[in-house]
């Protein structure tokens, strides 16, 4: 059997809503022919399912085989190195992969100007892989919150952080002209999920927006 292959040092999930990626660190001194076998265990079924026999990358998209994550007790994954006829011991994820491990994101933030007010609309993620009935708002049906970071340019570049409990918000601009920039980070008050800041969206207010149009 020759020298035993070392196991991948660590294996972990990095997940967003219906985007579930398994990662692992490479074994030391891997050869060009080293690849990695991935297996998955669903809690409650208790048998390992082989997912990939020979992945040469250091990550694997498990979304398609974990579509029921949001209605299940979760998963564990394991990875081992394979080189020809040799293989390493398995390295197993050290935490259960469940809905709690999913990092919350928003789809986008849209800003528009109306009567000198900036209206913000938070678009929820709509991943292609998600089954039709599994929308963000049906899975996280209560206690959705969003931290809003507002930056004014020109200005002293400090962010104003506020929490809102709706996907719509509006900004009172006090007649100020310039660029208003907004970032949003989602959370669910009843859950411990991490949230990720959206990319910054900006909109410019000029004097013309402060005339009465009522």
């Amino acid at each position: 059997h020759g020298t035993e292959l070392p196991s991948p040092p660590s294996v972990w999930f990095e997940a967003e809503f219906f985007h579930h990626i398994l990662h692992w660190t490479p074994i030391p001194n891997q050869s060009e022919s080293t690849c990695y076998e991935v297996a998955l265990l669903r809690y409650g079924i208790e048998s390992w399912n082989s997912i990939s026999n020979c992945s040469q990358t250091l990550s694997y998209d498990l979304t398609a085989v974990t579509l029921d994550l949001y209605h299940s007790n979760g998963y564990r994954a394991r990875v081992r190195a394979v080189d020809g006829s040799r293989h390493s011991n398995w390295t197993v994820t050290n935490t259960r992969f469940s809905v709690d491990e999913v990092t919350l994101t928003v789809g986008s933030v849209n800003l528009e100007i109306h009567n000198g007010f900036i209206l913000g609309k938070i678009q929820l993620p709509r991943p292609k892989m998600a089954p039709a009935n599994d929308t963000y708002e049906s899975i996280f049906s209560h206690f959705r919150e969003y931290e809003i970071a507002i930056r004014k340019v020109p200005g002293n570049f400090t962010f104003t952080h506020k929490k809102v409990k709706h996907e719509n918000f509006s900004l009172l601009t006090s007649g100020e002209v310039g660029e208003f920039c907004v970032q949003v980070k989602p959370s669910v008050a009843s859950r411990s999920n991490k949230g990720m800041w959206s990319k910054e969206e900006c909109i410019s207010l000029t004097r013309q927006y402060f005339t009465v149009t009522n």
């Epitope: 000198g116 009172l172 402060f210």
Partner: nanobody, 125 residues
Framework: QVQLQESGGGSVQAGGSLRLSCAAS????????MAWFRQSPGKEREPVAV????????FYPDSVKGRFTISQDNAKMTVYLQMNSLKSEDTAMYYC??????????????????WGQGTQVTVSS
Amino acid sequence: QVQLQESGGGSVQAGGSLRLSCAASRYLYSIDYMAWFRQSPGKEREPVAVIYTASGATFYPDSVKGRFTISQDNAKMTVYLQMNSLKSEDTAMYYCAAVRKTDSYLFDAQSFTYWGQGTQVTVSS
């Protein structure tokens, strides 16, 4: 310091109308925004309407858009909320609020400095 006094609340049948008034102790030009908020038992204060006093520009959340109208009378130092096509879910305590200058930007209760005592609106079906 700005004192605010609401009036005009009361009971009305669903589909009816009410007009709330908010009298300010200072001229409105010393205030950036005047707004109406409402709060029903066990819920947070939610914004209903806001007016930018310098231009008269207004904004309404979707829940009241097309039914409620905020307006101002600078001479009388008063802001009004005309409420039409009232529904039972409009039942709440209605508060008038003002802020001189906001660096908070977000249209929510925390952004407003001055508050009235509130006036009760009850809509029965």
